[in-house]
């Protein structure tokens, strides 16, 4: 029943509903999930909030809430409403929030919405709306937020939106929209957020976003776009852009030339093969750029003006060289992943003072010079596996005080410089068949995990049996891209940090160290006692 509170207010609390003052001499009334089939009758004229969601109300009569002139929020979500008559909201002069989601409406209730001049938020999502009449929002001059997602729209209701010049956020996601015409949102100059994800959009008018001068977030994820959405070029305030999970094959030159404020771009799960060299220029706010498998890229991108990039991943392309000035453009880079390319020669990375992780595995690198990795004081992880490295300058790693992980497996090394590597916790040298010398454990006091070409080389680390072996010990996080983690997410800008996984593994290995000083593989055993004697 009514909350046992005294005062005139609570006399207007319907049976079984929960009522409480809102702090302004008005009443909040919660009648949700009570199995009601009609609206309660004895509501206080001083009601400011009325929740009737999750009931069985199938119809509203004209003027069902007379005299609720102070009502600011009305929730009718999760009922069985198929139609809302003219006059249903008559007299609700203060109404700011109207929730009609999860009903069975087939079109926007134009007449019922007329003259709700104070309305700021309108939820019509999760209905069966296939038609939005041209004038249905014409009286809603204060509307700020509009939800039309999860309906049956097949086209943008262009004319209906023309009257919503104050609108700030709108979602049309989860519909069946196939095309966005020119000037579809031409009068929405205050719109900041626009969600169009999970539609069937295959084409965009060249000027479809013209007029959206305040837009900061645009979500085109999970559509059928075949071409890069060049129409974004007029969105000068755009900060977050998503067009992942489409069918886009190339990103053109100057792709984001009109979007200098971009902070985040999600474009994974597209069959991108080619990216214009100038595509990502002049994006000073961009922090992360990830592009996997663009096999037609042969040149490193020109990132002039994108100086705040912290993470650059450009894998599976055909880049054969890096400009000598690469770090001049990217002074803030912390993570560089250029694995699975055709790199032969490396520039000096010493200007990239903030680099913490470099991944250059699966390239064609044949030599590491003295200046390649000089003075990278923050570098923690360096992966050079699966290259053709035969020569490493004796002092190549001498000024890397933070380096704890080094992977040189599957190269052509016959010797290995130890200078500067005393802080290593992980060292991988397996697959260097010409590397037959013993490495002293004294040079690596912090070592936890080491992988050597031959079993006998593990004897130096006191490993004489394979007591605690974990398969694929090295860097488990590296093989599954962050893109995979995003695939299931229809939401737009979820962020996950792969470093969490690495830290977990490091902690796990720390526990192992307490049991066993160094984990070395391949572990010597009765069938692998002296492989070096049998070689050659």
């Amino acid at each position: 029943g009514s909350s046992p509170r005294s005062g005139v207010l609570l006399r207007g609390c319907p049976t079984h509903c929960h009522c409480e003052p809102d702090g302004r001499m008005l009443l909040r009334v919660d009648c949700s999930d009570l199995g009601l089939s009609e609206l309660p009758s004895n509501l206080s004229v001083f009601t400011s909030y009325l929740d009737l969601s999750m009931n069985n109300i199938s119809q509203l009569l004209p003027n069902p809430l007379p005299s609720l002139r102070f009502l600011e929020e009305l929730r009718l979500a999760g009922n069985a409403l198929t139609y809302i008559p003219k006059g249903a909201f008559t007299g609700l002069y203060s109404l700011k929030v109207l929730m009609l989601q999860n009903n069975q409406l087939r079109h926007v209730p134009t007449e019922a919405l007329q003259n709700l001049r104070s309305l700021q938020s309108l939820r019509l999502d999760a209905n069966h709306i296939s038609y939005v009449p041209p004038s249905c929002f014409s009286g809603l001059h204060s509307l700020r937020h509009l939800w039309l997602d999860d309906n049956a729209l097949t086209e943008i209701p262009v004319q209906a939106f023309r009257s919503l010049s104050a609108l700030q956020a709108m979602t049309l996601a989860l519909n069946k929209i196939h095309h966005i015409p020119d000037y579809a949102f031409g009068n929405l100059s205050s719109l900041v957020v626009l969600h169009l994800h999970n539609n069937r959009i295959h084409s965009l008018g060249k000027k479809c976003f013209d007029g959206l001068h305040s837009l900061e977030t645009l979500d085109l994820n999970y559509n059928n776009l075949d071409e890069f959405p060049t129409a974004i070029r007029t969105l000068s305030n755009l900060k977050e852009l998503g067009f992942h999970s489409n069918n886009i094959r190339s990103i053109p030159e100057k792709a984001f030339v009109g979007n200098p404020s971009l902070i985040t771009i999600h474009f994974y799960d597209n069959p991108i093969q080619f990216v214009g060299r100038s595509a990502f220029q002049h994006l000073p706010e961009l922090r992360t750029l990830t592009l996997n498998g663009a096999s037609q890229i042969t040149e490193f991108p020109d990132l002039t003006g994108t100086a705040n990039l912290e993470s650059l991943t450009l894998t599976g392309a055909q880049i054969s060289s890096l400009p000598q000035t690469v770090c001049n453009q990217l002074p803030n880079l912390q993570v560089l992943d250029l694995s699975y390319n055709l790199l032969e020669d490396l520039p000096s990375f010493s200007v990239c003072q903030k680099l913490q992780k470099i991944d250059l595995r699966h390239n064609e690198i044949y030599e590491i010079k003295v200046d390649t990795f000089q003075q990278l004081l923050s570098l923690r992880s360096l992966n050079l596996a699966w290259n053709k490295i035969a020569i490493i300058h004796p002092n190549a790693f001498s000024t890397l005080p933070s380096l704890i992980k080094l992977d040189l497996s599957s190269n052509l090394l016959s010797s290995f410089p130890i200078t500067g590597l005393h802080g290593l916790t992980h060292l991988k040298l397996t697959g260097n068949h010409a590397l037959q010398s013993l490495i002293s454990s004294e040079n690596f006091p912090e070592l936890k995990v080491i992988e050597m070409p031959y079993a006998y080389q593990c004897c130096a680390f006191g490993v004489c049996e394979n007591a605690y072996k974990i398969s694929n010990q090295w860097n488990k996080g590296d093989n599954s891209s962050m893109d995979d983690l995003h695939k299931k997410d229809a939401g737009m800008f979820q962020a996950q940090d792969e470093r969490d996984l690495e830290d977990f593994l490091l902690d796990f290995e720390e526990d192992l160290k307490a049991l066993h000083s160094v984990q070395c593989s391949p572990s010597p055993g009765p069938f692998k006692p002296c492989e070096h004697l049998l070689d050659g």
């Epitope: 009068n187 001068h213 070029r233 000068s236």
Partner: antibody, heavy 118, light 111 residues
């Protein structure tokens, strides 16, 4: 205040080229299309084409496609129209205008008179 | 190309009287409920000035004696009460499809 300021009048010989500039101010340069329109003496208005400054996005009236070239310089917020192989019938006032609400031309330059005469 | 035909070519109206200019497009310029038709005023020695966009929307700063109507192929610009400063040439323009085209102009004078 939005302004489009065009370069001064030009006199050219037939077969020559002319380059007209249009300097924009008072708004975000790259967010609006710039249209080029010409008006022969005593005649009506004729659309030449459009460019989205900073990008390579251009559209030309088929009639001018071979002879007209639009370029832009974002550092100076300036758009250029170059018209080559001039003939006497190209004598006109050339206007730049901003494509505003729904592509309507809401701000115009003052015009540049190009006279082609031998 | 879409051909825009204005009528009449010239119009003389007394001060304070109504002036009506018509514009017909050779094909519809409507798209998704919007009519991509605009009206401009040009005075001698000046560039054109936008009056009406999308057939019926008054541009900011334009006196409300100017109004536009129509859809599809037939459009009208009305000056409800002609003032001396309204003497000019008036142009309609479509930007429904390339190339964008203008009417030939209607000259409005005082009778």
């Amino acid at each position: 205040e939005v302004q489009l300021v065009q370069s001064g009048a030009e006199v050219k010989k037939p077969g020559a080229s002319v380059k007209v500039s249009c300097k924009a101010s008072g708004y975000t340069f790259s967010a609006y299309w710039i249209e080029w329109v010409r008006q022969a003496p005593g005649q009506g208005l004729e659309w030449i084409g459009e460019i989205l400054p900073g990008s390579d996005s251009t559209d030309y009236n088929e009639k001018f496609k071979v002879r007209a070239t639009f370029t832009s310089d974002t550092s100076t917020s300036t758009v250029y129209l170059e018209l080559s192989s001039l003939r006497s019938e190209d004598t006109a006032v050339y206007y730049c205008a901003r494509g505003g609400h729904y592509g309507s031309l809401d701000y115009w330059g003052q015009g540049t008179l190009v006279t082609v005469s031998s | 190309d879409i051909v825009m035909t204005q009528s009449p070519d010239s119009l003389a109206v007394s001060l304070g009287e109504r002036a009506t200019i018509n514009c017909r497009a050779s094909e519809s310029v409507d798209n998704y409920g919007n009519s991509f038709m605009h009206w401009y005023q040009q005075k001698p020695g000046q560039p054109p000035k936008l009056l009406i966009y999308l057939a019926s929307n008054l541009e900011s700063g334009v006196p409300d004696r100017f109004s536009g109507s129509g859809s599809g192929t037939d459009f009208t610009l009305t000056i409800s009460s002609l003032q001396a400063e309204d003497v000019a040439v008036y142009y309609c323009q479509q930007n429904y499809e390339d190339p964008f085209t203008f009417g030939q102009g209607t000259k409005v004078e005082i009778k």
